[in-house]
């Protein structure tokens, strides 16, 4: 994997010499053994006739917050600790003037890994032990002796998983973009085995190669507006914890059972991927869970295949792609890989060829935002604490964050006279500095209106003459009446408006005998029904890529990709006058709420979808029974 | 220097839709936070929306539900899709990447701003 003459196993490459554009301050020339990586650093190379000028920051979200490392100390015993001080050398960036292009390196002995630009893909690793402005081997990664790897989910399996192969015909987006929503984050935990152990040589080298995997992975997923997070490493420094066979799926299956027994004691994590020294039989280097993403099956085995780190980098990502739903590009008609070059193939090849890729194809993407729509993808949502981020808070970001009052952005362009923009706390004299009741740094009088009513099943806000937020977002009671049904939780829930949201524009809801019966398993229709609070029957519209269907006469139902589960009827959905859906079955609106709710609030509130109070204007919660004036003066505090 | 580049604005009517885009010349990755500001005639600039580089989003309360920031990092490019919309939000709305910079407080980078007109 690192052998003394890394060059003897390229077969084209350029010697570079790297000059480091002086930063504007004299730390962040120091040298890098002194522990002092700077937060951005710039590079000039020559290589391929250009001279391309990398921009690069720290990779500050590489590591989660509670981060830990895994091994087997000198007496045999198992050790978990949490680092102290987490500065690293991992960074990511671009190259100037290069609008696509994308870069990841450690920068901790020498430059090493890779910078993209347009559709090229350079390498690049130190030849000797001159640091960063030591000679450096620049290379293509098909000038890098390896033979093409394969990955070893199979056709068979995948059709099964993702459902009927006509299902997988790729419809490209209009506009071929990715959809708009939030960063999505997969928190990592990487498992490295005794042969791999035994390839690097130490826990430094393994944690280096580690963390230098996990950077090239987060920066491709990057593109997919997702983030790579290492939240634990164990390293088998002694010996295997499982047995590692050649055969990746017997592999693959004693890690996820492996990884059942060790939850409880080890790191909460979205995905556990396993890098190994064992050579997998044949061409195979990955092997993967397909969908299995926030699952207990949620992980990959890795063959750490290429001496360069990108190699396993890429596979690594190839096989979570896999556990965010997506297939081999091969297998979807019209799946598109923007490659320049025929050669070129994007992460979810089934082979990797002898170049590395660098992108996933629109199909993919397609694949991944269909994954996202399920609910199984809710542990991809939540983002690591701001508060934890390594780094920490940040004054001047417009985000108040631990330690803040106020936040109003950098120093020069702050507008906000409420809020002292290089401390972030609030200024002399004002009570707040954001929020819609606050003015002029002083919190609104109580019962002013700050968040109108938005449609039938919302209620106003009013400010509560305290806090210089609007209060919380509040509904009408469940089970008022709407277009068509009855509000549930802000929503007015239909089975058109269902069928609508799943199958597209042309999606309605199916015959209403389609609801009388339950499906098993393998698409049986089974015992007789006798509501419409089963599993969702809709007709027309477009089939939601990337999902199974069941279909018995006109009825279209959606599944999981085992077939063994159905997108169910969601709570609240009217099925019948003065009924809805509630714990699968079709019940009187009465299961919403008390019979004497409203009557607690004196005449001066309405009840909201919590089975609160919420009072009319200048009235205090819990019973709008006292003006807010009057709870204020009884308190004597003002914010 | 970091260039920012809006588009997207125009004249509606009350009640429609817009999709603003910036498009930056470096990655986006590297700001630490990016933001959409606006300026009526007469009025000081106020914050609209802004997205973490955790992906975090923040808010002004009178755009809260109406308005989406977004960003797509293989593009450079952050987005504001705005729906419901009515004749105050009428203004320039300028585009603002925040660069975090070690031992130094963080520095703005702003657009040239792009025309939103909303008629009743």
């Known amino acids: 994997i690192a052998p003394s003459r890394p060059w003897a196993l390229m077969e084209q490459y350029e010697v570079v010499l790297p000059w480091r554009l002086p930063g504007p301050r004299v730390r962040r020339a120091l040298p890098s053994h002194l522990g002092l990586h700077p937060e951005r650093v710039s590079y000039v190379l020559g290589a391929t006739g250009h001279n391309f000028t990398l921009h690069l920051r720290k990779n500050r979200d590489l590591l989660g917050s509670g981060y830990t490392e895994t091994y087997t100390a000198a007496n045999g015993s198992e050790v978990t600790e949490q680092p102290r001080g987490q500065d690293h050398c991992f960074y990511q960036g671009h190259v100037e003037g290069y609008p696509d292009s994308a870069a990841s390196l450690s920068t901790c002995a020498g430059l090493r890994g890779f910078f993209q630009v347009g559709s090229d893909l350079h390498l690049i690793e130190p030849l000797d032990e001159g640091g960063e402005g030591g000679r450096h081997a620049v290379y293509q990664a098909e000038h890098l002796l390896q033979t093409a790897g394969t990955c070893g989910v199979s056709d068979d399996s995948l059709g099964s998983l993702l459902g009927p192969r006509t299902a997988a015909v790729f419809r490209p987006r209009p506009g071929d973009s990715l959809p708009s929503r939030e960063t999505r984050y997969v928190e990592l935990y990487v498992v490295v085995d005794n042969a791999e152990f035994q390839m690097l040589g130490s826990e430094a080298a393994v944690r280096h190669r580690v963390l230098e995997v996990v950077n090239h992975v987060d920066k491709l997923y990057q593109k997919l507006n997702f983030r790579v997070v290492l939240v634990g490493l164990e390293i088998w420094n002694s010996q295997d914890r499982f047995h590692v066979s050649p055969d990746p799926s017997v592999t693959l299956e004693n890690l996820l059972t492996w990884q059942a027994r060790q939850r409880t004691r080890r790191h909460l994590h979205d995905n556990v991927q396993l890098i190994t020294g064992v050579d997998f039989t044949g061409t195979t280097v990955g092997f993967a869970r397909v969908s299995a993403m926030c699952s207990h099956s949620s992980g990959a085995v890795n063959q750490d295949h290429s001496k360069n780190p990108v190699g396993v980098a890429c596979t690594m990502a190839h096989e979570m792609g896999h556990n965010l739903g997506m297939d081999h590009d091969e297998n979807v008609q019209g799946c598109r890989c923007q490659e320049r070059f025929e050669a070129g193939r994007c992460i979810m090849a089934g082979s990797i060829g002898s170049s590395f890729p660098r992108m996933f194809s629109d199909c993919s993407q397609a694949y991944l935002e269909s994954f996202l729509e399920r609910p199984q993808s809710v542990c991809l949502a939540n983002a690591p604490d701001l508060s934890h981020l390594v780094g920490g808070p940040v004054c001047g970001n417009l985000f108040v964050e631990r330690g803040e009052q106020c936040d109003c952005g950098p120093p020069e362009d702050c507008r906000n006279r409420c809020c002292n923009s290089t401390t972030c706390q609030l200024a002399e004299g004002a009570q707040c500095a954001h929020g819609t009741c606050c003015q002029e740094c002083k919190v609104k009088p109580a019962g002013e209106l700050c968040r109108p009513k938005k449609d039938m099943c919302d209620l106003e806000e009013f400010c509560d003459g305290r806090h210089p937020e609007c209060p919380e977002d509040a509904f009408q009671e469940n089970g008022t009446p709407c277009s068509g049904g009855y509000c549930y939780n802000g929503a007015c829930p239909t089975l058109a408006q269902q069928c609508q949201a799943f199958w597209g524009p042309g999606g309605q809801a199916a015959e209403e005998s389609c609801f009388s019966y339950d499906i098993l398993p393998g698409c049986k229709a089974s015992r007789y029904r006798a509501d419409m609070c089963g599993v969702l029957q809709c007709k027309g519209g477009q089939q939601p890529l990337g999902r199974a269907i069941c279909i018995v006469d006109v009825c279209h139902a959606l599944t999981t990709e085992d077939g063994t589960a159905y997108e169910p009827v969601p709570e609240g959905t009217r099925c019948g006058p003065e009924k809805v859906c509630w714990k699968g079955r079709c019940q009187d609106l009465h299961v919403y709420r008390s019979s004497n709710c409203s009557a607690q609030c004196h005449n001066h509130g309405v009840c909201n979808h919590k089975q609160e109070c919420h009072c009319h204007a200048g009235w205090a919660p819990p019973h709008c029974a006292k003006l807010l004036t009057e709870v204020h003066a009884a308190s004597g505090s003002l914010p | 220097e970091v260039q920012l580049v809006e588009s997207g604005g125009g004249l509606v009517q009350a009640g429609g839709s817009l999709r603003l885009s910036c498009a930056t010349s470096?990655?986006?990755?590297?700001?630490?936070?990016m933001a959409w500001h606006r300026q009526a005639p007469g009025n000081q600039r106020e914050l609209v929306a802004a997205i973490h580089i955790s992906g975090n989003t923040n808010y002004a309360d009178s755009v809260k539900g109406r308005f989406t920031i977004s960003r797509d990092n293989g593009k450079n490019t952050v987005y504001l899709q705005m729906n419901s919309l009515r004749p105050e939000d009428t203004a320039v709305y300028y585009c603002?990447?925040?660069?975090?910079?070690?031992?130094?407080?963080?520095?703005?980078?702003w657009g040239q701003g792009t025309q939103v007109t909303v008629s009743s």
């Open positions: 470096g990655s986006i990755a590297s700001f630490n936070a």
């Open positions: 603002n990447a925040i660069e975090v910079r070690t031992g130094l407080s963080p520095r703005g980078h």
